[in-house]
């Protein structure tokens, strides 16, 4: 036998308490689906949470994070604090990444450089704590020999005029 | 407190017409399915019509085609219209408020005290 509460809309309950009739949700809650016996408490966005979406009878609030916060978790269920590009959050607060790591996010953790020489290419820009290293192109590439539709221009190194 | 009034019932000729309406009071009326039933002499209450929120309409054999059903949110009330009335539609005829907005086998959480439709030459 069918459920005498299927057909209850979204944004109401099934009353038990009324013979199980559809009554409303009561405010500040709601019901996302139909047949619902019960109304759930809408989420409350307090603190470094903040309202994105109100609350209605058929769906929850949505919540974001105040400036210099962002959200983790599904559907922002926590704020953690921004740092700055060329930083990390630690327990102890932002730091800056160490020699050979960059962050070029206000989230997330310091990464290493791309390492050039495994690809068999040269550093074409340094790495900093913000941005990663710029590969060139390799040696072979730069063989007057190599078939190249637009060969790449010399890369020029420190200290040492073109030939 | 959930009540359902109902009025417009009395005597007509057979192949006539009447219309009786249920005034509904104490409950979220545009939510809820409502339902007609009626219970002739001697018989078993029986379905007659009833109408969901979303207005879907269901309505028993014996009266299809001849009894309509509709509702007024704004008025928080329930009709039913009949027409081509015949000596067994006689019967004392109830306002039903219906389970979980439910009109496919429906179920009566709320009763009204009924009104006497006599047919009869």
């Known amino acids: 036998l069918q459920d005498p509460c299927s057909n209850c809309p979204a944004g109401t309950f099934c009353d038990n308490n009324r013979n199980q009739i559809c009554s409303p949700c009561p405010p500040n809650s709601f019901s996302s689906a139909g047949g619902q016996r019960t109304c759930d408490i809408c989420r409350q966005c307090k603190g470094v949470f903040r309202t994105r979406k109100e609350c209605s009878s058929t769906s929850n609030a949505e919540c974001d994070c105040t400036p210099g916060f962002h959200c983790l978790g599904a559907g922002c269920s926590m704020c953690e604090q921004d740092c700055k590009q060329g930083q990390e959050l630690t327990k102890k607060g932002c730091k800056d990444c160490c020699f050979g790591t960059f962050n070029d996010q206000k989230r997330g953790i310091c990464r290493p450089w791309t390492n050039c020489s495994l690809d068999g290419k040269s550093v074409l820009v340094n790495g900093t704590k913000e941005r990663d290293v710029v590969c060139g192109p390799s040696p072979a590439d730069l063989s007057p020999g190599a078939s190249s539709v637009t060969p790449p221009a010399p890369a020029r190194e420190p200290g040492h005029s073109p030939q | 407190e959930v009540q359902l009034l109902e009025s417009g019932g009395g005597e007509v000729q057979p192949g006539g017409s009447l219309r009786l309406s249920c005034a509904a009071s104490g409950f979220s009326f545009s939510i809820n399915a409502m339902g007609w039933y009626r219970q002739a002499p001697g018989k078993r209450r029986e379905f007659v019509a009833a109408i969901e929120s979303g207005r879907n309409t269901v309505y028993a054999e014996s009266v299809k085609g001849r009894f309509t059903i509709s509702r007024d949110n704004a008025k928080n009330t329930v009709y039913l219209q009949m027409s081509s009335l015949r000596a067994e539609d006689t019967a004392v005829y109830y306002c039903?408020?219906?389970?979980?907005?439910?009109?496919?086998?429906?179920?009566?959480?709320?009763w009204g005290q009924g009104t006497l439709v006599t047919v009869s030459s």
């Open positions: 039903g408020l219906l389970k979980g907005n439910r009109v496919v086998s429906p179920s009566v959480a709320y």
